[in-house]
C-alpha cells in the first residue's frame, strides 16, 4: 500500500490516575504505513529516556496501517516539576517531524 | 508477581486530540497480573475505530496497555463512550466513562 | 472550506454508479462523510457513512444496493445495479452537518 | 435503524408568528439531533446540533430543545425568509443506530 502519515494525538494523566501517585502521558500514533515511526519524548524541551515503553498494533487487516502507542511513565511528584509534555514524531509520511504538546494544568 | 486487577485510567478527548473532524479518546488498563485483559467499547456496540495495543510488560512484573478508539468530533458532546474492561485471572471488570475533560 | 459531487448522469436500469466526492479548503481524510440522497420532490434519505478508517454502515435500505468507500482525496458511492426508484439528487455532507456538496443529480430510466 | 418521526408535514403561520415543529426518535438519541433548514434547489443548511445548540451565524429565534426521544424546534418571529422546508437527523454515531432524517416539515406564510 502506499505511505500513510500518522495522526498524531497526546493525552494527559487523568486525574483519577495523579491521585494514586503516578503519571501516564500517552502519545497515539493513528493508521500509518509503512510500520517505521519514532516517538521522542521532550518534557520542558528536555528529552527524556529510558522512562517510556511503546506498543504497535498488528498490521490493519482492511487498510493495512498500523498504530502505535508511547506511554511516558513519570512519578507524580516528577510530573507536577514541569509544565511542557511533548511527543515528537517522525515518519517516511511526514514532510516534517509533527509534535504533539501540552501544558500541564491546561485544558 | 500474584494475580492483581487492573486500575483504568481514562484518556480523555481534548483540543489535542482532535484532528479535522475526527476525535481520539481511550483508557489505559494499568498495572495487572497476569495477561490478559479484553477491553470493549459501548459493550460490543463500538467496534469502528478501535485500537487495543499489545500489553507492555513494566519494570514492576506489571502488565499495561492502552484501548483507543477515534470518533466523529461532533459526537462528543452528545453521547456517552464507555470502556468495558475485564480480567479474568482477578475477577475483575470495570466500565469506564470517558468524556471530554471540564475545565 | 466545500463539497463538490460528481458522477451524477442519466443510466439505464441496471448499469452500475458511481458518484465522487471531493474536498476543498480541507482534508477529507480526517472526516467522517455521509451520503444523502433526495427524490425529486420528496424529503432526505441518509444512505450511509463512511468512518475514518474506511468502515462504512448504512440504512438498512441501503445495504447490498450501495457501497461507499474512500481513499484520501476522495469519497465515493457506488450503485451497483440502480433501479427508476434511485433517481435522485445525491449529496455528500461532513457528518458534523455543516458542510454539504451542491448535490449531482442521477436519472435512472429505460 | 432509530426511525425519525417527524410532525406536522406542513404548516402555515402569518409573519411575526411561532412555528414548532416535533421530531419523535424510535429510541433515546441522547442530545444527538440536529435540525436543517432547505430552501428548492439547494442543499440542507445546518441550524441546530446537539439538539439545543445554535450554529454560528443562525438568527437567535431559531431554538431547539429536547433530549432522549422528544426533540423540538421552535422558530418565533416567523420571517418570509424563513420559508423552507425543515428536517430533523439522528447524530448519534454508531452503527446500530444510523443518521435517519425526520419526513420534513414544509413551513409557509399565512
Known amino acids: 500500500r502506499t505511505v500513510a502519515a500518522p495522526s498524531v494525538f497526546i493525552f494527559p494523566p487523568s486525574d483519577e490516575q495523579l491521585k494514586s501517585g503516578t503519571a501516564s502521558v500517552v502519545c497515539l500514533l493513528n493508521n500509518f504505513y509503512p510500520r517505521e515511526a519514532k516517538v521522542q519524548w521532550k518534557v520542558d524541551n528536555a528529552l527524556q529516556s529510558g522512562n517510556s515503553q511503546e506498543s504497535v498494533t498488528e498490521q490493519d487487516s482492511k487498510d493495512s496501517t498500523y498504530s502505535l502507542s508511547s506511554t511516558l511513565t513519570l512519578s507524580k511528584a516528577d510530573y507536577e516539576k514541569h509544565k511542557v509534555y511533548a511527543c515528537e514524531v517522525t515518519h517516511q509520511g511526514l514532510s516534517s517531524p509533527v509534535t504533539k504538546s501540552f501544558n500541564r494544568g491546561e485544558c | 508477581a500474584s494475580t492483581k486487577g487492573p486500575s483504568v485510567f481514562p484518556l480523555a478527548p481534548s483540543s489535542k486530540s482532535t484532528s479535522g473532524g475526527t476525535a481520539a479518546l481511550g483508557c489505559l488498563v494499568k498495572d495487572y497480573f497476569p495477561e490478559p485483559v479484553t477491553v470493549s467499547w459501548n459493550s460490543g456496540a463500538l467496534t469502528s475505530g478501535v485500537h487495543t495495543f499489545p500489553a507492555v510488560l513494566q519494570s514492576s512484573g506489571l502488565y499495561s496497555l492502552s484501548s483507543v478508539v477515534t470518533v466523529p468530533s461532533s459526537s462528543l458532546g452528545t453521547q456517552t463512550y464507555i470502556c468495558n474492561v475485564n480480567h479474568k485471572p482477578s475477577n475483575t471488570k470495570v466500565d469506564k466513562k470517558v468524556e471530554p475533560k471540564s475545565c | 472550506q466545500s463539497l463538490e459531487e460528481s458522477g451524477g448522469r442519466l443510466v439505464t436500469p441496471g448499469t452500475p454508479l458511481t458518484l465522487t466526492c471531493t474536498a476543498s479548503?480541507?482534508?477529507?481524510?480526517?472526516?467522517?462523510m455521509n451520503w444523502v440522497r433526495q427524490a425529486p420532490g420528496k424529503g432526505l434519505e441518509w444512505i450511509g457513512t463512511?468512518?475514518?478508517?474506511?468502515t462504512a454502515y448504512y440504512a438498512s435500505w441501503a445495504k447490498g444496493r450501495f457501497t461507499i468507500s474512500r481513499t484520501s482525496t476522495t469519497v465515493d458511492l457506488k450503485a451497483a445495479s440502480p433501479t427508476t426508484e434511485d433517481t435522485a439528487t445525491y449529496f455528500c455532507?461532513?457528518?458534523?452537518?455543516?458542510?454539504w456538496g451542491p448535490g449531482t443529480l442521477v436519472t435512472v430510466s429505460s | 435503524d432509530v426511525v425519525m418521526t417527524q410532525t406536522p408535514a406542513s404548516v402555515s403561520e402569518p409573519v411575526g408568528g411561532t412555528v414548532t415543529i416535533k421530531c419523535q426518535a424510535s429510541?433515546?438519541?441522547?442530545?444527538?439531533l440536529a435540525w436543517y433548514q432547505q430552501k428548492p434547489g439547494q442543499p440542507p443548511k445546518l441550524l441546530i446540533h446537539?439538539?439545543?445548540i445554535l450554529e454560528s451565524g443562525v438568527p437567535s429565534r431559531f431554538k431547539g430543545s429536547g433530549s432522549g426521544t422528544e426533540f423540538t424546534l421552535t422558530i418565533s418571529d416567523l420571517e418570509c425568509a424563513d420559508v423552507a422546508t425543515y428536517y430533523c437527523?439522528?447524530?448519534?454515531?454508531?452503527?446500530?443506530?444510523?443518521?435517519?432524517f425526520g419526513g420534513g416539515t414544509k413551513v409557509e406564510i399565512k
Open positions: 455532507a461532513r457528518y458534523d452537518g455543516d458542510i
Open positions: 479548503g480541507f482534508s477529507l481524510s480526517t472526516y467522517y
Open positions: 463512511i468512518t475514518i478508517d474506511g
Open positions: 429510541q433515546s438519541i441522547s442530545t444527538a
Open positions: 446537539g439538539a439545543s
Open positions: 437527523q439522528c447524530t448519534y454515531y454508531g452503527i446500530s443506530y444510523g443518521n435517519a
